[in-house]
């Protein structure tokens, strides 16, 4: 007996051939033995079975002999075993479909859970074998899960499902909801002004939500809402903003917000959550913020930065076009009688440099410059 | 420790006013938006009114407009909620709580204080 | 004003039993709602923000979901202090409104 795997919602083309190359009468019937289609002459006739409007066959192909049962849409319950009878010979054909479907929305959130379920005939055992878009395999029966999606399971998902010897393939698309980074730093002088951006790592048509950034100051004893926020088909407007900092915020994604000036009061880390329209749970996306300041303070210049360095970080204080004077693994360092000229203050990572502020002290007599 | 002591309720004629204060500590208070909730006998809870930082915006629910003011004072710590023409259906246990929560929720309340209107 | 409906007003259960309570909002209130516990003569206790995130503190039995008009708090394995009354509230539009409550009583 022949085995045909097909795929719900797909149309399959089972074949029936007569040794003849010619228009002879055939019947196709279930195994319940009920006439699905055949001919009469060069007319199609139907049957009374549950396939009657979705069968059919190629009328172009009786006069070589070939007379196919098509079904179109499939479902589950299509799988059966098709009898073909024709010059007095029976050709049996055993359909079986499968429908590989993912467990609720294929737009999903980052860190939720991938179930896909196959659906298979009674009697059947089958496998399935899926690949992620970068390149995971996983394997199972009836249901597969994959816990904790990442932003790289975003894609398209081959799935083959193997019964008999035989493979059927399905492909399903993937949306992964996420930011695209988890984590971002921003390097700033006090003084300056502060952008930070939440780029989405997706495109829908429609975005609907609503979000919060919250807070944290490395000064502040507790976390606060900075800004809430609605966001209909892409537009954001803001529902309340705390009155210090007075942030902004852009009107049109990616979501943008605008801290006036950086302060050390500000420096700190803030996750920015952001909830979408009918789904349980939210994206998250921290921030950090870390501020510089030099002063000089009598016969004291000093360097500091507030917020959330790693310890590997190098602040410096040095004579222009000069070696560093003063160089610590510390968030703050200075140097006592500097001498006239214009200094910098450099915090630096492996020698890179990520935050410079340049202070100039003039000679004792006089106050000093902050350019 | 985050903390609000209501205080000022009691029994009053219809018609009347009582003016109901909320203590806060352990925390700063003007960095808060505080709302007031109250809870008739038996019954469900009502948001009253809320108001932001530093007092300049103000918002309360169409049954108490025009008899209830909200307001606050940041050197002190303390909210208030001054009632005029009191009626019959005012009588609840009236709530202090803070606006703190992420997402607008109202993180912490107090105890509540109850006020009673009767002849 | 956004009316606020909860289903059941009261419903009987056994310490173990999952329970689940509904809030229905009269208009779109995108993910601005929140589920209070409260005690008898106690003020209410905040157990979830953002219709979705666990405030911290509290037990992990408790989860919310939904967003937009439907909401759904979900006690799992109920614990004998369970036993008491919920409200659910929306903080989109004000006046803030908060639902009729829900007794979550002993069988």
């Known amino acids: 007996k022949k085995v045909v795997l097909g795929k719900k919602g797909d149309t399959v083309e089972l074949t029936c051939t007569a040794s003849q190359k010619k228009s002879i009468q055939f019947h196709w019937k279930n195994s319940n033995q009920i006439k699905i289609l055949g001919n009469q002459g060069s007319f199609l006739t139907k049957g009374p079975s549950k396939l009657n409007d979705r069968a059919d066959s190629r009328r172009s192909l009786w006069d070589q002999g070939n007379f196919p049962l098509i079904i179109k849409n499939l479902k589950i319950e299509d799988s059966d075993t098709y009898i073909c009878e024709v010059e007095d010979q029976k050709e049996e054909v055993q359909l079986l479909v499968f429908g590989l479907t993912a467990n609720s929305d294929t737009h999903l959130l980052q860190g939720q859970s991938l179930t896909l379920t196959l659906e298979s005939p009674p009697g059947s055992s089958p496998s399935v074998q899926c690949r992620s878009p970068r390149g995971k395999n996983i394997q199972g029966g009836k249901t597969l899960s994959v816990s904790q999606l990442e932003l790289q399971d975003s894609g398209t998902w081959t799935c083959t499902v193997l019964q008999n010897q035989k493979k059927v393939e399905f492909k399903i698309d993937i949306v992964v909801l996420a930011f695209q980074k988890a984590s971002s730093i921003v390097y700033k002088k006090e003084g300056e002004q502060v952008e930070f951006s939440f780029p989405l790592a997706f495109t829908v048509e429609k975005l609907t939500g609503s979000g919060e950034l919250w807070w944290q100051a490395e000064r502040a004893s507790s976390s606060k809402s900075w800004i809430t926020f609605d966001l209909k088909n892409k537009e954001v407007s803001v529902k309340r903003v705390t009155q210090d900092p007075k942030l902004q915020m852009g009107k049109k994604l990616p979501l943008h917000l605008t801290l006036p000036q950086a302060l050390p009061q500000y420096a700190g880390s803030g996750n920015l959550t952001l909830a979408l329209e009918a789904k349980t749970g939210k994206l998250h996306q921290e921030v950090n913020l870390v501020v510089m300041r030099a002063t000089q303070l009598q016969k004291n210049l000093t360097c500091e930065v507030w917020g959330p360095t790693s310890p590997k970080l190098m602040l410096s204080l040095k004579l222009e076009n000069k070696e560093a004077k003063v160089s610590k693994r510390e968030k703050a360092v200075w140097v006592l009688n500097p001498e006239a000229g214009m200094w910098q203050c450099l915090l630096s990572d492996s020698g890179q440099v990520l935050l410079e502020s340049n202070i100039k002290v003039l000679p004792t007599w006089s106050t000093p410059v902050q350019p | 420790e985050v903390q609000l002591v209501e205080s000022g309720g009691g029994l009053v004629q219809p018609g009347g006013s009582l003016r109901l204060s909320c203590a806060a500590s352990?925390?700063?208070?003007?960095?808060?938006?505080m709302s007031w909730v109250r809870q008739a006998p038996g019954k469900g809870l009502e948001w009253v009114a809320n108001i932001n930082q530093d007092g300049s915006e103000k918002y309360s629910v169409d049954s108490v407009k025009g008899r209830f003011t909200i307001s606050r004072d940041n050197a002190k710590n303390s909210l208030y909620l001054q009632m005029n023409s009191l009626r019959a259906e005012d009588t609840a246990i009236f709530y202090c709580?803070?606006?703190?929560?992420?997402?607008?929720?109202?993180?912490?309340w107090g105890q509540g204080t109850l006020v009673t209107v009767s002849s | 004003d956004i009316q606020m409906t909860q289903s059941p007003s009261s419903v009987s259960a056994s310490v173990g039993d999952r329970v689940t309570i509904t809030c229905r909002a009269s208009q779109g209130i995108s993910s601005w709602l929140a589920w209070y516990q409260q005690k008898p003569g106690k003020a209410p206790k905040l157990l979830i923000y953002?219709?979705?995130s666990l405030q911290s503190g509290v037990p992990s039995r408790f989860s919310g979901s939904g967003s937009g008009t439907d909401f759904t708090l979900t006690i799992n394995s109920l614990q004998p202090e369970d036993f008491t009354t919920y409200y659910c509230q929306q903080a989109n539009i004000f006046p803030w409104t908060f639902g009729q409550g829900t007794k979550v009583e002993i069988k």
């Open positions: 709580a803070r606006e703190g929560g992420q997402w607008l929720a109202l993180d912490y």
């Open positions: 352990g925390f700063t208070f003007s960095d808060y938006w």
């Open positions: 953002g219709a979705s």
